[in-house]
């Protein structure tokens, strides 16, 4: 069928609650494309009827709620004018383990998410709630080790739980809970977060190391497609942001209209002492205006750039 297959990582989800997955794969989905969801290589697309428990909502697949039998491989097919990509997403559903009734009625969810708080600092946890615009989320409640969180050191701010003066005792099994409303029906969303505490050895934060690029120029022909990786090593517990900028602006914002130059999805490889992060920049078509501009990779306080330049004329051709 001429579609290019892309395999995404597995998603492990808990049953009996809403779940949504957005089919985005920059730069493929940045232009005029159509997105269609399928389950287990079925020829029949996922329903677009909003009353269906499982339905497609714009580029999203939405489960209201997720059920035990929903495990499987889902495909979203992205068709552009001249391209077709099929993204495979493996969803595994598990039953929640609820807290003992003697302690309270909240689940002890292990490793759905892992987050870190920094000892002695003011820090925060994030409740990851990714749903389409058709879903309205109510205020978030936070729990730790099956008990609702109370106390002056904790403040709920939108999707974050702010923790002031983090203590070793703040580690534990957290859960954030929200009510999701869709088409007049209400559903409970509950995400488990395993929180550990770290204290940076030494004084102050770590400085990420940009392995590539190295402040250099790249020869590239006009009109070609170019992908450049930014490779960064950083500590496992880092909170540094990695991104590409041009003229001190995020490339995705700078080229928001044309989407001709886009930042890719960050990936990382975990080593014993550090993580190696990769975030690329894609030039769909190199134009004259791109030459001579420094495209900067930022990682925390570290920066490195590439400059595109036209290849030197090859006089041997004459």
């Amino acid at each position: 069928d001429g579609c290019k297959d892309i395999f995404m990582k597995n998603e492990i989800l808990s049953a009996s609650q809403p779940f949504a997955f957005n089919c985005t794969f920059p730069p493929i989905t940045s232009g005029e494309v159509s997105v269609t969801w399928y389950k287990n290589s079925s020829k029949i697309p996922v329903s677009k009827i909003i009353q269906s428990r499982i339905h497609q909502d714009e580029t999203w697949i939405l489960f209201l709620p997720m059920e035990w039998g929903d495990s499987g491989v889902y495909q979203c097919v992205i068709k552009g004018r001249d391209s077709c990509h099929r993204i495979h997403v493996n969803l595994t559903v598990f039953e929640k383990h609820w807290c003992d009734t003697s302690i309270g009625g909240l689940p002890n969810l292990s490793d759905e998410y892992k987050q870190i708080l920094h000892l002695g600092k003011d820090d925060s946890l994030t409740c990851h709630l990714h749903f389409p615009k058709s879903c309205v989320l109510g205020p978030i409640k936070w729990y730790k080790d099956c008990n609702e969180i109370k106390g002056e050191r904790f403040t709920v701010l939108e999707t974050r739980l702010l923790v002031s003066n983090v203590s070793a005792e703040d580690r534990g099994n957290y859960a954030c809970q929200a009510i999701l409303t869709h088409s007049g029906k209400q559903y409970e969303v509950l995400n488990g977060i395993t929180v550990s505490i770290t204290e940076r050895a030494g004084y102050g934060g770590s400085v990420p190391k940009i392995i590539y690029p190295k402040n250099h120029s790249i020869e590239v022909q006009l009109g070609t497609t170019l992908i450049v990786d930014c490779n960064v090593t950083d500590t496992k517990d880092n909170t540094n942001l990695r991104c590409w900028r041009v003229n001190n602006t995020l490339v995705d914002d700078y080229y928001d209209e044309s989407k001709r130059i886009r930042e890719g999805v960050e990936t990382h490889v975990s080593f014993r002492e550090h993580n190696l992060y990769t975030v690329n920049i894609t030039f769909l078509e190199v134009k004259m205006e791109d030459y001579g501009l420094p495209f900067m990779c930022h990682a925390g306080v570290s920066t490195a750039y590439i400059i595109l330049q036209l290849p030197a004329p090859d006089f041997r051709a004459y």
């Epitope: 000892l119 080790d145 580690r171 505490i197 050895a201």
Partner: antibody, heavy 120, light 107 residues
């Protein structure tokens, strides 16, 4: 392999200060916390305090006014200083490594202990 | 401070027996409970962390269970080298505290 070894004075006069060194090997103090625990002969264990991977310490509230824990990461040494000793501070003093997970704070490796007697 | 109580100070059992040692916390400590073994020569070893996690190198005959305030350490098939004193310890709230101790002897 992981090893911890305490070295102390053995005998301390009442009202004097106690200074014990814990020498570690097989791991880095910038990755693991170190606890101090003592045991009065024939009795149970009492947790004294912990120094984390950076410079943060937590102490047993009953001893906080006379206890101090510090370390030298580069030399793999951890120090316990206790002031104003009395006879009931006579005990075996242990240093013990924490798990380094930042989640459960068990003590996974222990020194053999150093015996301290407070007597004039 | 959280008080940890091991109600049995000494326990006598035969080789091959299943032995259970109990520990109670004065308040809810969720699952933040560890078990240690002290040999007659004073050597201390971690057996179980976070209620039921078996520390590396510890024989699988040792297991832990519980939650909240009531916890137990079980030795499923008593061996001669298990003759020792056992302590529970909470790491839920500072100061971390130990139980009194349970001395295990052979009948």
């Amino acid at each position: 392999q992981v090893q911890l070894k305490e070295s102390g004075p053995g005998l301390v006069a009442p009202s004097q200060s106690l200074f014990i060194t814990c020498t570690v090997s097989g791991f880095s103090l910038s990755s693991y916390e170190i606890n101090w625990v003592r045991q009065v002969p024939g009795k149970g264990l009492e947790w004294l305090g912990v120094i984390w991977t950076g410079i943060t310490t937590n102490y047993n509230s009953a001893l906080i006014s006379r206890l101090s824990i510090s370390k030298d990461n580069s030399k793999s040494l951890v120090f316990l200083k206790m002031n104003s000793l009395q006879t009931d501070d006579t005990a075996i003093y242990y240093c013990a490594r924490g798990t380094g997970t930042g989640f459960y704070y068990a003590m996974d490796y222990w020194g053999q202990g150093t015996s301290v007697t407070v007597s004039s | 401070d959280i008080q940890m109580t091991q109600t049995t100070s000494s326990l006598s059992a035969s080789l091959g027996d299943r032995v259970t040692i109990s520990c109670r916390a004065s308040q809810d400590i969720y699952k933040y409970l560890n078990w240690y073994q002290q040999k007659p020569d004073g050597t201390l070893k971690l057996l179980i962390y976070y209620t039921s996690g078996l520390h590396s190198g510890v024989p699988s005959r040792f297991s832990g269970s519980g939650s909240g305030t009531d916890f137990s350490l079980t030795i499923s098939n008593l061996e001669p080298e298990d003759i020792a004193t056992y302590f529970c310890q909470q790491d839920s709230k500072f100061p971390w505290t130990f139980g009194g101790d349970t001395k295990l002897e052979i009948k």
